[in-house]
Interface confidence: medium
């Protein structure tokens, strides 16, 4: 048994950080393999976590963490059974991927003014919390080429936009994503994405 | 009332031991991670070693590796101090010190101290 | 290792005035960094935790501030029970160090 694609992982810098790699054959994930974490510190203690099967030859592994610092630095230790088949680190700071923003509701009421509002999946004490940036994606269930991307590069989680700005009389869905510049992260997920029927009133033509 | 009692420090030989003992009570001494920490004569302060709350896990930096081991007995509300191979730079007055159990990993304060116990290595 | 470099070594001041004392890591330590006082024969006491927050039973006078390398503590309006030393300690990575210390005495 051999390791064909290293662990690499991501972190949500909160609690969880996730591991993925690949194996050079068929592999039951979870009754042949255990990934051993330990953060490097002061009398911190080795955790173990149970891999699941990712595809055939592809494990992932859901590392639970209290609490993330930028200097935390973990060591891993992948093993079957008494046989270690790959060690390793992972700092999270280097490795940061948000949760992803919930709670995505729009607004339709507000005067031919659209707002969507989001949810920072962050709670105020973490560091992200006050360092997230959103793109907000809209689009058309009609028209797949009625598409576009909204940056949302202030704090607060929303955006307001023109209604008369999407085509009237038709269904839109929207979704949102995080990153966070300060980390270099990835991207989020994309939320799961809510839909409303879009309409608001022509103004009137003068003539 | 929160109290750490030292006790077994005195004058020893060059290269003999000792063993220090802290007597906790006013708290569920279990549920701490405990320490100790030495005051050298230039009024210096050292951790000189540390232990997780069920005993399982140690640590003592470089300068007494191998030669300090830290343990603990919960059901005496104990913690103890075993220093073997003195030396004359150990000479100090040794606390014993509770790290507070707010925070994170890296929170390792002391909000409860003893009020030490002195040992001298004399040659 | 992080060294802590505390100044000054020594400082005189009288009952009413205010004083700081300083703390500088080699590294970066974030907030990582406790205040410590200690009277003439007894054992530390934590005033500041996490370069800014104040232990329980710890005047307001006492402040704590800074993070990355560089800290300080504030006594406001000293009283005559907070002459002696003072240590900062940091808790970011092993070995923790503390400070040489700051002696407060009396003018």
């Known amino acids: 048994m051999k390791v064909l694609q290293e662990p690499t992982c991501v972190s949500d810098y909160m609690s969880i950080s996730t591991c993925e790699w690949k194996m050079n054959g068929p592999t039951n994930c979870s009754t042949e393999l255990r990934l051993l974490y330990q953060l490097v510190f002061l009398l911190s203690e080795a955790h173990t976590c149970i891999p699941e099967n990712n595809g055939g030859a592809g494990c992932v592994c859901h590392l639970l963490m209290d609490d993330v610092v930028s200097a935390d630095n973990y060591t891993l230790d992948l093993w079957a059974g008494q046989q270690l088949l790959w060690k390793g680190s992972f700092k999270p700071s280097e490795h940061v991927k948000p949760r992803a923003p919930g709670n995505l509701t729009v607004h339709t009421n507000v005067s031919d003014t659209l707002l969507l509002t989001w949810s920072n999946p962050y709670p105020p004490d973490n560091y992200l919390y006050n360092h997230l940036t959103y793109a907000v994606n809209i689009w058309s269930e009609n028209d797949p080429a009625d598409f576009r991307i909204y940056n949302v590069t202030y704090l607060e989680p929303s955006l307001r936009i023109a209604a008369s700005t999407l085509k009237s009389g038709i269904s839109y869905r929207a979704r949102v994503r995080a990153w966070a510049q300060c980390y270099n992260t990835t991207w989020s997920e994309w939320s799961p994405s809510t839909k409303w029927h879009n309409s608001y009133r022509e103004p009137f033509e003068q003539h | 009332d929160v109290k750490l009692v030292e006790s077994g420090g005195g004058l020893v030989k060059l290269g003999g031991s000792l063993k220090l003992s802290c007597a906790a009570s006013?708290?569920?001494?279990?549920?701490?991670?405990m320490s100790w920490v030495r005051q050298t004569p230039e009024k210096r302060l050292e951790l000189v070693a540390a232990?997780?709350?069920?005993?399982?896990?140690?640590y003592s930096p470089d300068t007494v590796k191998g030669r300090f081991t830290i343990s603990r007995d919960n059901a005496k509300n104990t913690l103890y101090l075993q220093m073997s191979s003195l030396k004359s730079e150990d000479t100090a007055l040794y606390y014993c010190?509770?790290?507070?159990?707010?925070?994170?990993?890296?929170?390792?304060?002391?909000?409860?101290w003893g009020a030490g116990t002195t040992v001298t290595v004399s040659s | 290792d992080i060294q802590m470099t505390q100044s000054p070594a020594s400082l005189s001041a009288s009952v009413g005035e205010t004083v700081t004392i300083t703390c500088r890591a080699s590294?970066?330590?974030?907030?990582?960094l406790a205040w410590y006082q200690q009277k003439q024969g007894k054992s530390p006491q934590l005033l500041v935790y996490?370069?800014?927050t104040l232990a329980d039973g710890v005047p307001s006078r006492f402040s704590g501030s800074g993070s990355g390398t560089q800290f300080s503590l504030k006594i406001n309006t000293l009283q005559p029970e907070d002459f002696g030393s003072y240590y900062c300690?940091?808790?970011?990575?092993?070995?923790?160090?503390f400070g040489a210390g700051t002696k407060l005495e009396l003018k």
């Open positions: 232990i997780n709350s069920n005993g399982g896990s140690t």
């Open positions: 006013g708290f569920t001494f279990s549920s701490y991670y």
């Open positions: 590294e970066n330590i974030y907030s990582y």
């Open positions: 996490n370069a800014k």
């Open positions: 010190a509770r790290r507070s159990l707010l925070g994170n990993h890296r929170d390792w304060y002391f909000d409860v």
């Open positions: 300690l940091h808790h970011y990575g092993t070995p923790l160090t």
